[in-house]
Each structure stands twice: as structure tokens, then as C-alpha cells.
């Protein structure tokens, strides 16, 4: 399986909400002995490998933000901890999973990584990740809504989170 990032860059005004998205692409084994662990963390663009370093998102670690389920089941973080920090991660039945960040500040700018781990006994631990950048802007040059830049081309889209 692979992870796709529909958008590689999100440019948002301060105070806005944004939803960062990743998509799990098949083939996805839906056997009873296979489960998927999905989570989010901040990182930096390493010289060797992007997303190798794991930093918290608003003081929440990737352990606090994970989703766990088999195949393409829906799931979301329900505990109050994430919501108290203005965060919520979720996934749907189609392999999409996301993290929503509310009331953005300049400190939220940086590189964000989604991680998927396939858990299967007696097999290698299969890990894949996706990376995207969030730029939070303030002042007269800031957009009125979030602008997202697709990973495949340089065309941009305006979105209202």
C-alpha cells in the first residue's frame, strides 16, 4: 500500500481552521490478522529522509493522535485531550484520514507528517508516510481563506475549512 498527500502545501490565515489530509491507497489487505495504525506528527525536512524525526503537534505526541482499525474502517480520536488542544484526527471508509487544527497561530507553521503502519504478525512492520507543509500567515498579505496547492501540479485551490 501507499500513502498519497492530495496537497503538499497549505497556506492559511491566522485564526482559521485547516484540515490536513492523507489517503491510504490499495491494495489494502483486509484480513483478520491485519490492522492499520494511522497517526500524525510534526517533523523537519531531514537531509536524508523527510519525516524521520517526530515532534509533537501542539504538545500532543503521535501516540495521542493515532487511529487504529482494520482495513478501511472509519475511526476518529474521541478523547478530550486532542480536542482541548484544538485538534481532531479522523478517517473514513475510503482510506482518507485527516487532522483538523482549529484557530491556527503562527506557531503551527511547519512540516506535518501522516504515518501508516501495517500491523501483521510474523511479517515485517510496513511503514509509509506522507508529508505536507503548513504556512500560517498574518497581516495584509495573508489569504482570507486557506489556499491549498496540489501535490501533482502547481495549481492552487481556495478552500474554506
Amino acid at each position: 500500500f501507499k500513502v498519497a498527500t492530495p496537497y503538499s502545501l497549505y497556506v492559511c490565515p491566522e485564526g482559521q481552521n485547516v484540515t490536513l489530509t492523507c489517503r491510504l491507497l490499495g491494495p489494502v489487505d483486509k484480513g483478520h490478522d491485519v490492522t492499520f495504525y494511522k497517526t500524525w506528527y510534526r517533523s523537519s525536512r531531514g537531509e536524508v529522509q523527510t519525516c524521520s524525526e517526530r515532534r509533537p503537534i501542539r504538545n500532543l505526541t503521535f501516540q495521542d493522535l493515532h487511529l487504529h482499525h482494520g482495513g478501511h474502517q472509519a475511526a476518529n480520536t474521541s478523547h478530550d485531550l486532542a480536542q482541548r488542544h484544538g485538534l481532531e484526527s479522523a478517517s473514513d471508509h475510503h482510506g482518507n484520514f485527516s487532522i483538523t487544527m482549529r484557530n491556527l497561530t503562527l506557531l503551527d507553521s511547519g512540516l506535518y507528517c501522516c504515518l501508516v503502519v501495517e500491523i501483521r504478525h510474523h511479517h515485517s512492520e510496513h511503514r509509509v508516510h506522507g508529508a505536507m507543509e503548513l504556512q500560517v500567515q498574518t497581516g495584509k498579505d495573508a489569504p482570507s481563506n486557506c489556499v491549498v496547492y496540489p501535490s501533482s501540479s502547481q495549481e492552487s485551490e481556495n478552500i474554506t475549512a
Epitope: 490478522d33 490492522t35 495504525y37 536524508v48 524521520s52 503521535f62 501516540q63 495521542d64 493515532h66 487504529h68 478523547h79 485531550l81 504515518l115 503502519v117 500491523i119 504478525h121 510474523h122 511479517h123 515485517s124 512492520e125 511503514r127
Partner: antibody
Framework: QVQLVESGGGLVKPGGSLRLSCAAS????????MSWIRQAPGKGLEWVSW????????YYADSVKGRFTISRDNAKNSLYLQMNSLRAEDTAVYYC???????????WGRGTLVTVSS | EIVLTQSPATLSLSPGERATLSCRAS??????LAWYQQKPGQAPRLLIY???NRATGIPARFSGSGSGTDFTLTISSLEPEDFAVYYC?????????FGQGTKVEIK
């Protein structure tokens, strides 16, 4: 930040049983995947068993499969290891540790000593 | 299962010296290798994850390198509190396995 404290160790005769507990303080234990790891006196570390946050799936080392059972009670913030048919070679300090997929054992308890001897 | 072999078994050095510890895997573990430090009577502490990344709060004098089957933990300048036993551990395959440990002792 979660803190882990093991209990339930002690002296038991070969063939006997023991139940270890790992109590977690702090939040959110119910989100964490956990393992038991043991260390025989003066020896190295050996992974014993793993359990997901929801209780399934569960994995065991071949050396304990069929004799040990891992379980958890998220409402009580507790992890357990039921050890049956104990052998002398099971003598060790048993640690519980957080073991998230794609990650490492990043949070450990202080351990509880199990001695199997006649 | 994957066997991890650490060398040397014991390393006798003085404070301020450089320590180089080796871990070799019986088959490739990609970069899914960690290093732990353990002091007498204490639980192990995570130092390095994914072969080369320092865990939170670990001093910069600790560094890890390698991929595949050969890995190295380097302590650039030993501090008194660094004398301990160091274990490597792989999570590429079940079961999780550890090396037998390298003891870093004061010369």
C-alpha cells in the same frame, strides 16, 4: 504523561501460576499499545508479549505461547500478564512498556521480580 | 527470528573519550533499529530510534548510524553518567529482539 508501575511478582514453584499487573497513571492509557519485556538476572532483554490499545490483536514470543496470557482493562488503566506452567527459565524482572506501532519502547515501568524455584 | 549481535561485550574507557558500539543483524532490519541505555537497578531508557534519531531529551553527544544489517552507536565524549549497559533492538519483524548488550565501564 503516563507512569507505569508493575506489581504481582514473587516466589513461585515450577508449574505454578502468577498474575502480574501494570498500573498506569495519567492519560490516556486506553490509547496506548503495550508490551511485557523481561530480563533474567544478569542477562539481556527479551520481549514477551504485545497487546493493542483495544485488546486485539495480541502477540506472544514463542517461549511463552500457550502459557502466558496478556490482557488489559482500560477502565482500570491496567495491563496484566497471567503466567501459568511457570519454569525456572521464566525467572526474571518483568517490565511493562509502551510499544506503539512504528515506534519503540519509549516508556517503561520499574519492573517486578518473578522467581521460579522449588 | 532476527538475531542482533553487539560488540564488543565490554568497552573500558575513561570520561571524555569516544565510545563506538556496534550492532549487527542476522538479516536486514531496514532502519528500524533502536538503542537503549540501562543502569543497574533501573529500566532501560530509549536513546535512539529509527537508527539515527535521538529520542526526546537525549544529549547531542549520543548519535546513531547505519541501515540494513550494520549499526553504530557513538558517544562522542563520555560523561560519568554514561557508564552503563547499551542494548540495540529491532522492530522490523516479530518477534521484537534485542542484542545481548555492551557494557561501557570506567577504565
Amino acid at each position: 504523561q503516563v507512569q507505569l508501575v508493575e506489581s504481582g511478582g514473587g516466589l513461585v514453584k515450577p508449574g505454578g501460576s502468577l498474575r502480574l499487573s501494570c498500573a498506569a497513571s495519567g492519560e490516556p492509557f486506553s490509547d496506548y499499545y503495550m508490551s511485557w519485556i523481561r530480563q533474567a538476572p544478569g542477562k539481556g532483554l527479551e520481549w514477551v508479549s504485545w497487546i493493542s490499545n483495544s485488546g486485539e490483536p495480541i502477540y506472544y514470543a514463542d517461549s511463552v505461547k500457550g502459557r502466558f496470557t496478556i490482557s488489559r482493562d482500560n477502565a482500570k488503566n491496567s495491563l496484566y500478564l497471567q503466567m501459568n506452567s511457570l519454569r525456572a527459565e521464566d525467572t526474571a524482572v518483568y517490565y511493562c512498556a509502551r510499544d506503539e506501532p512504528g515506534w519503540e519502547f519509549d516508556l517503561w515501568g520499574r519492573g517486578t521480580l518473578v522467581t521460579v524455584s522449588s | 527470528e532476527i538475531v542482533l549481535t553487539q560488540s564488543p561485550a565490554t568497552l573500558s574507557l575513561s570520561p571524555g573519550e569516544r565510545a563506538t558500539l556496534s550492532c549487527r543483524a542476522s538479516q536486514s532490519v531496514s532502519s528500524y533499529l533502536a538503542w537503549y541505555q540501562q543502569k543497574p537497578g533501573q529500566a532501560p531508557r530509549l536513546l535512539i530510534y529509527d537508527a539515527s534519531n535521538r529520542a526526546t531529551g537525549i544529549p547531542a553527544r549520543f548519535s546513531g548510524s547505519g541501515s540494513g544489517t550494520d549499526f553504530t552507536l557513538t558517544i562522542s565524549s563520555l560523561e560519568p553518567e554514561d557508564f552503563a549497559v547499551y542494548y540495540c533492538q529491532q522492530r522490523n519483524n516479530w518477534p521484537r529482539t534485542f542484542g545481548q548488550g555492551t557494557k561501557v565501564e570506567i577504565k
